[in-house]
């Protein structure tokens, strides 16, 4: 009765072969499937087997795999046959080592989080670097600070707001000497003196396909900065949007497929269909990014009956500009993001 995410021992009965050293056949045609699909453990995808025949529970990290019993694609697993030379028949599910990133000459591994400087925290995700600002740029309430300005303070990474009061004598912005906002690590739980702050969403971690966008917010019981995340998809990877640019034009700012679609995530399907807009592309150096967007909650239903919801970026409009002419300047987007207030909702 013990559960394991996928079978740890596989009872393969390959068809008899003349040459026993050759590769066994794990697929049989016509397909022979059990009358009903199996029940998969929580967190394990129900997928179609490698023979394109039957439903099966995807093999997990460290499980044996074959051309029939395939590894969980939603977890970035592949079948490593290197231990079964020369037959290459039975492998072991292994993690796809994602593409690393290079920033300012420094190489970072896929999934690695790092701070290139004191103002940003970044993560390398499959060759793309996504960053969140560590300096909270909240403006102090006008009620007790009508003339704020930001100043650099020696020994502090982040600029701080100071107030110019009527006597033209600068003072820190927060009343009762609670201290001004500094780097996230230095923000204390403010309780009653808490200034609610939510940073803009960071740019999507991928330029096409499913990515992640993050932001920092202290809107919680502890008034402590926490990272929130949402899924984002700026444009599909499998559509060449260049071919859709009209003759004589250099850009297509927004691309919207004609048919509505369901979002899919880890083998689960959104409970309703959507007709999303995507940002387009340009023929020149300009790039297209969202400037009117919001966050929606998408509910997913899985084959095993379970459901969950995720926050997802919903693009309303995009614009194309030269701000990302230098693809290595990953901070350019972050600096300009607060200017578009629609993005941070």
């Amino acid at each position: 009765t013990a559960l394991s995410p996928a079978p740890t021992t596989m009872d393969f009965t390959p068809a008899p072969l003349e040459d026993t050293s050759s590769r066994p056949q794990f697929c049989k045609w016509p397909c022979e499937c059990p009358p009903s699909p199996p029940r998969c453990p929580l967190g394990v995808s129900l997928i179609t087997d490698g023979c394109e025949c039957c439903k099966m529970c995807a093999q997990q990290l460290g499980d044996n795999c074959t051309e029939a019993a395939i590894c969980d694609p939603h977890r970035g697993l592949y079948c490593d046959y290197s231990g079964d030379r020369p037959r290459y028949a039975i492998g072991v599910c292994a993690q796809v080592v994602g593409v690393g990133c290079v920033l300012d000459g420094v190489r970072y591994n896929n999934g690695q989080s790092f701070q290139p400087n004191c103002k940003y925290n970044c993560t390398c995700i499959d060759g793309a670097v996504g960053c969140t600002p560590l300096c909270l740029r909240v403006r102090p309430p006008r009620l007790w600070c009508p003339h704020p300005r930001r100043v650099s303070i020696p020994g502090h990474c982040c600029e701080q707001w100071v107030c110019e009061d009527d006597a033209k004598r600068p003072r820190k912005t927060a009343p009762r000497d609670t201290g001004a906002f500094d780097a996230v690590g230095e923000v204390e739980a403010w309780h009653r003196n808490c200034i609610a702050y939510t940073s803009p969403w960071s740019p999507c971690s991928t330029s096409c396909g499913l990515g992640v966008s993050t932001r920092i917010s202290n809107v919680n019981a502890q008034c402590w900065p926490e990272q929130e995340s949402r899924l984002c998809n700026l444009r599909p990877c499998d559509v060449d949007i260049h071919t859709l640019i009209k003759a004589g034009k250099k850009c297509l700012a927004v691309y919207q497929p004609e048919a509505s679609m369901n979002f899919t995530l880890a083998g689960c399907i959104s409970t309703r269909s959507y007709q999303p807009k995507y940002c387009g592309v340009c023929m020149d150096n300009r790039c297209c990014i969202p400037y009117k967007s919001k966050t929606i909650d998408v509910s997913f239903q899985c084959p095993d009956g379970l459901g969950f919801s995720r926050q997802v970026l919903w693009i309303n409009a995009c614009f194309c500009n030269l701000s990302c002419r230098n693809p290595n300047d990953i901070f350019a987007d972050l600096e300009s993001y607060p200017d578009f207030s629609e993005i941070a909702n």
């Epitope: 009903s36 699909p37 029940r39 453990p41 929580l42 967190g43 394990v44």
Partner: antibody, heavy 117, light 112 residues
């Protein structure tokens, strides 16, 4: 043999927090979904929350949603339950239990959480 | 959520006599794989629950064969052919077909 040992229970005031732990041994912890189930004094069993084998999928009972957080550390063979904003009606023995695909096959001995002012 | 309703809630039995506990679910418990995930647990006084039966009628190892489970659809039964003193405790049914898992209120078995 499979063993699940809960710890971290105690007396706490309403509104405060508590973190329960469950140490697992005798099986490959990282391959099993795990549950927390509770039992108020003199009452029946109430399912609280579950986490998948790798923590990627988590579900909560409506009564604890937004207040309790289940997590696991597979490298330490340990399951956790972070309980915030505790209420008097959270008073119960909390059991850690192993999932068996539509069932629960092993239970810990339980740890008592008393929420009282 | 699926509501599990047990009856009776209290069951006084004479040692050596049979006992029967009913469990009814508010919706069908057949999963898409064809299995019915209905479980029975025993909780002796001061102890943790212990699984007796899974998937309606499968007995766990170490469980005496005087315990048996039956039923289908929404109606299920746990039978004890001859009650012994060590069987005293509370018996719970639990469905594991739909999320979240849900338990019955429990049936307290005591010796007359």
């Amino acid at each position: 043999q499979v063993q699940l040992v809960e710890s971290g229970g105690g007396v706490v005031q309403p509104g405060r927090s508590l973190r329960l732990s469950c140490g697992a041994s005798g099986f490959t912890f990282s391959r099993f979904a795990m549950h927390w189930v509770r039992q108020a004094p003199g009452k029946g069993l109430e399912w609280v929350t579950v986490t998948s084998f790798d923590g990627s999928e988590i579900y909560y009972a409506d009564s604890v949603k937004g207040r309790f957080t289940i997590s696991r550390d597979n490298s330490k063979n340990t399951l956790y339950l972070q309980m915030n904003s505790l209420r008097v009606d959270d008073t119960a023995v909390y059991f850690c239990a192993r999932d068996a695909l539509g069932s629960i096959d092993y239970w810990g001995q339980g740890t008592l959480v008393t929420v009282s002012s | 959520d699926v509501v599990m309703t047990q009856s009776p809630l209290s069951l006084p039995v004479t040692i050596g006599q049979p006992a029967s506990i009913s469990c009814r679910s508010s919706q069908g418990l057949v999963y898409s794989d064809g299995n019915t995930y209905l479980n029975w647990f025993q909780q002796r006084p001061g102890q943790s629950p212990r699984r007796l039966i899974y998937k309606v009628s499968n007995r766990d190892s170490g469980v005496p064969d005087r315990f048996s489970g039956s039923g289908s659809g929404t109606d299920f039964t746990l039978k004890i052919s001859r009650v012994e003193a060590e069987d005293v405790g509370v018996y719970y049914c639990m469905q594991g077909t739909h999320w979240p898992y849900t338990f019955g209120q429990g049936t307290k078995l005591e010796i007359k």
